[in-house]
C-alpha cells in the first residue's frame, strides 16, 4: 500500500480468482483514543471500533472511502483505491491501446519544434468518475524538470456503438536548448483513476523523435506564362524552430487529381518553392519534415489548381 | 526517398556537401546495423545513449547559432581549447568562433574515426562475420576531415591484446552509430547555417 496523495491510498493486488488479497491497517487521524467507529462509503454499518481498523482487501467491494467517527462526528477519511496486477503485468483497463506506432501505445506525444514544449494525448471509452494527473521529467535517475498542465478533455468521437474520449496535456521542459543533443529521454507518467481503480501509464521519448512540424504556411500558386506549369511557393510554419538555416525543413509537393485513384505526382525539395504541372480540378499540397532527422511529416497544406 | 528531388545549388561552402554525405552514410549504416543485429538491443529505446566526445569537445556549444546564444539553457559551455586554422570558409571570413566550431567538428570526426576503425578490426575477427562497417561511411568521414583541413595530432588506433567479446562489440557499435548519427545531424545543421550566413 502507498499514498497517492493526502488521505488517498493505493493497494496493489495480485489479481486472480480466490486470491488472498492484502491485509491493510487503517489508522484514524485523531488524538482521540476511545469511542471510535469505522464505516465504508455511505453505509452506516459499523465495520469495527478502535483507533485502527484491520481489513483484508481482495476485491473492489473492499475499496472505497473508510471513515472514522466519534459520537456522530467525522474524524478522518482514508480512500482506498485498487491497482490490479494480472499475471505480473499491471492492468490497463482505463485507456485504449492506440496501436500506433506499435501495440501497447496508450500515450502518444508530439512536438511542433525543438523548444522543449510537447503535447501528449490518450483515449478512453469511460465518460464519468475519471481523473488524470500528469508528471514528467527529463531522465529518471537524476530527473530534470518538466512542467505539465492539467489534462483536459480535447475531443469526443463516436466509434461504432461506443463514444471515445480524447484527453490531452501540454508540457514544457523547464530549461530546454533547441540545439541540444538529447541523451536522456523525456519520461511522461499519467496516473488514471476510474471510480476505485488506479492505473498508471508511462511514455519515454526524445523530443527529436516526436517532432511533427505544423504544415507550411502561405501556400501560393503563380502561373508561368505560356505554360501549364505553376510556381508553388510557401513559408516555414510560424511554430517551427529558428533560425531556419539551422533548423532546416525539407518539403514534399504533391499534385493530386480529384479522384483518389489518379496518379499522384510528387517532388521533394529543400527550397520553399517548386515548379509543377497543374492539372484541371487537381489540388497542390505541400508538407514539411525536419531536413536532417526523419521524424514525422507535417499534415498537408493544400490549394486548388484553379 | 526514391522520388525526384529538386537539389539545391552547391553553395560557396565546400563542407556542406560532405556533411550531407556523412549523414546519409551514417543513417544507412545504422539502418543496416538495426536490421542485421535484430536479436541484439540496437534500437534507440534499448541502448544507452553515450557520447564519446563528452568533456573532450563541445561542438553544440561552439557551433551554436548566434540567435540561440541569448538562450541561457544553451550556454552550459565547457572550456575546451582548439586549433583554429580551418579552411572550409574563405580565410577572411573565418572568425575565431567559427574556427573553434569547425575544429570541434574535426575533433569529433577524428575520435569517431578511431573508434570505428578499432571496432571494425574486432568485427573482422568475428567467426560469424555478421556485420562490418561500411567502407563508404569511413571514406566520407575522411573526406569531411580533409575538407575541414585542420592540423592535429594523429590519434593512434587502439589495439587490444585480449580476445574480443563480439556480443559487446556489436552492442557498442549500435551505441556508437546512434551517437554518431545525432552528431552528424548537428554537423549538418551547422554547415547549413554557416552556408546561409
Amino acid at each position: 500500500i502507498w499514498e497517492l496523495k493526502k488521505d488517498v491510498y493505493v493497494v496493489e493486488l495480485d489479481w486472480y480468482p480466490d486470491a488472498p488479497g492484502e491485509m491493510v491497517v487503517l489508522t484514524c487521524d485523531t488524538p482521540e483514543e476511545d469511542g471510535i467507529t469505522w464505516t465504508l462509503d455511505q453505509s452506516s454499518e459499523v465495520l469495527g471500533s478502535g483507533k485502527t481498523l484491520t481489513i483484508q482487501v481482495k476485491e473492489f467491494g473492499d475499496a472505497g472511502q473508510y471513515t472514522c467517527h466519534k459520537g456522530g462526528e467525522v474524524l478522518s477519511h482514508s480512500l482506498l483505491l485498487l491497482h490490479k496486477k494480472e499475471d505480473g503485468i499491471w492492468s490497463t483497463d482505463i485507456l485504449k491501446d492506440q496501436k500506433e506506432p506499435k501495440n501497447k501505445t496508450f500515450l502518444r506525444c508530439e512536438a511542433k519544434n525543438y523548444s522543449g514544449r510537447f503535447t501528449c494525448w490518450w483515449l478512453t471509452t469511460i465518460s464519468t468518475d475519471l481523473t488524470f494527473s500528469v508528471k514528467s521529467s527529463r531522465g529518471s535517475s537524476d530527473p530534470q524538470g518538466v512542467t505539465c498542465g492539467a489534462a483536459t478533455l480535447s475531443a469526443e468521437r463516436v466509434r461504432g456503438d461506443n463514444k471515445e474520449y480524447e484527453y490531452s496535456v501540454e508540457c514544457q521542459e523547464d530549461s530546454a536548448c533547441p540545439a541540444a543533443e538529447e541523451s536522456l529521454p523525456i519520461e511522461v507518467m499519467v496516473d488514471a483513476v476510474h471510480k476505485l481503480k488506479y492505473e498508471n501509464y508511462t511514455s519515454s521519448f526524445f523530443i527529436r523523435d516526436i517532432i511533427k512540424p505544423d504544415p507550411p504556411k502561405n501556400l501560393q500558386l503563380k502561373p508561368l506564362k505560356n505554360s501549364r506549369q505553376v510556381e508553388v511557393s510557401w513559408e516555414y510554419p510560424d511554430t517551427w524552430s529558428t533560425p531556419h538555416s539551422y533548423f532546416s525543413l525539407t518539403f514534399c509537393v504533391q499534385v493530386q487529381g480529384k479522384s483518389k485513384r489518379e496518379k499522384k505526382d510528387r517532388v521533394f525539395t529543400d527550397k520553399t518553392s517548386a515548379t509543377v504541372i497543374c492539372r484541371k480540378n487537381a489540388s497542390i499540397s505541400v508538407r514539411a519534415q525536419d531536413r536532417y532527422y526523419s521524424s514525422s511529416w507535417s499534415e498537408w497544406a493544400s490549394v486548388p489548381c484553379s | 526517398r526514391n522520388l525526384p528531388v529538386a537539389t539545391p545549388d552547391p553553395g560557396m561552402f565546400p563542407c556542406l556537401h560532405h556533411s550531407q554525405n556523412l549523414l546519409r552514410a551514417v543513417s544507412n549504416m545504422l539502418q543496416k546495423a538495426r536490421q542485421t543485429l535484430e536479436f541484439y538491443p540496437c534500437t534507440s529505446e534499448e541502448i544507452d545513449h553515450e557520447d564519446i566526445t563528452k568533456d573532450k569537445t563541445s561542438t553544440v556549444e561552439a557551433c551554436l547559432p548566434l540567435e540561440l546564444t541569448k538562450n541561457e539553457s544553451c550556454l552550459n559551455s565547457r572550456e575546451t581549447s582548439f586549433i583554429t586554422n580551418g579552411s572550409c570558409l574563405a580565410s577572411r571570413k573565418t572568425s575565431f568562433m567559427m574556427a573553434l566550431c569547425l575544429s570541434s567538428i574535426y575533433e569529433d570526426l577524428k575520435m569517431y574515426q578511431v573508434e570505428f576503425k578499432t571496432m571494425n578490426a574486432k568485427l573482422l575477427m568475428d567467426p560469424k562475420r555478421q556485420i562490418f562497417l561500411d567502407q563508404n561511411m569511413l571514406a566520407v568521414i575522411d573526406e569531411l576531415m580533409q575538407a575541414l583541413n585542420f592540423n592535429s595530432e594523429t590519434v593512434p588506433q587502439k589495439s587490444s591484446l585480449e580476445e574480443p567479446d563480439f556480443y559487446k562489440t556489436k552492442i557498442k557499435l549500435c551505441i556508437l552509430l546512434h551517437a554518431f548519427r545525432i552528431r552528424a545531424v548537428t554537423i549538418d545543421r551547422v554547415m547549413s547555417y554557416l552556408n546561409a550566413s
Partner: antibody, heavy 115, light 111 residues
Framework: QVQLVQSGGGVVQPGRSLRLSCAAS????????MHWVRQAPGKGLEWVAF????????YYADSVKGRFTISRDNSKNTLYLQMKSLRAEDTAVYYC????????WGQGTMVTVSS | SYVLTQPPSVSGTPGQRVTISCSGG????????VKWYQQLPGTAPKLLIY???QRPSGVPDRFSGSKSGTSASLAITGVQAEDEADYYC????????????FGTGTKVTVL
Amino acid sequence: QVQLVQSGGGVVQPGRSLRLSCAASGFTFSSYGMHWVRQAPGKGLEWVAFIRYDGSNKYYADSVKGRFTISRDNSKNTLYLQMKSLRAEDTAVYYCKTHGSHDNWGQGTMVTVSS
Amino acid sequence: SYVLTQPPSVSGTPGQRVTISCSGGRSNIGCNTVKWYQQLPGTAPKLLIYGNDQRPSGVPDRFSGSKSGTSASLAITGVQAEDEADYYCQSYDRGTHPALLFGTGTKVTVL
C-alpha cells in the same frame, strides 16, 4: 472453490459451426479476464482467444481470427467460444482458463472436425 | 508459431536432478514473467511455477524455476516416477499481451 465446467464439444463437419461454453462458479466471474486454449492430439498448447473482465476487449490468435468469437455473459457467469467455418486443423481439446498469476482450468472439451 | 523453445524430451533416473530450458527473446521472456505447467496424460495443465520462481501452495518443493535474460528453466531435484509428464513454459510478448505464448513442450521420462 473455483470451478470451470465446460460443454459443447463434439464431432462437426468442415465448414460448420459449434459453440463451446464454460460455466464459472466459486468466484466473482465479472472481475476477471478469461482465455480459451486448445491442444491438438499429440501436440502442444496453443492460445486461442482472450476476453476482458467486462467484455470490452477481445484478442484472437491469427489462426482463428475472423472465424471464432469469444464472448461472455457476466449475468450467467458463462464464457463462450463461437466457432464458424471449422477446419480439420481446429480438431483439438479446448480449455477455458482464468487470467492471472494463479490460474484455474476447465476440464477440457474435445472438438473433432471431420467429414 | 512457437516463439518459446524447449527441448522435446529429457530423462533421468529417480532421485536425479532434471532441468528443462525455455528459450525466448527480448520482447517476451526478456521483459515478462514465466510460468511452468505440468500436464499428465488426458488432464488439463497444472500450474507449477508462476512469476519465474514462485511455487503455488501444494506444489512440492522439488520443483523450482529461474529466469536469466531471455531464457528460463525448470529444475526437478530428486525426480520421481509421478513427475513423468509433459511440461510447458508460458510467457507473454510485450506487443501481443494478453495473448499467451506457450513453449513447444518437453516430455520428461523417468527411467
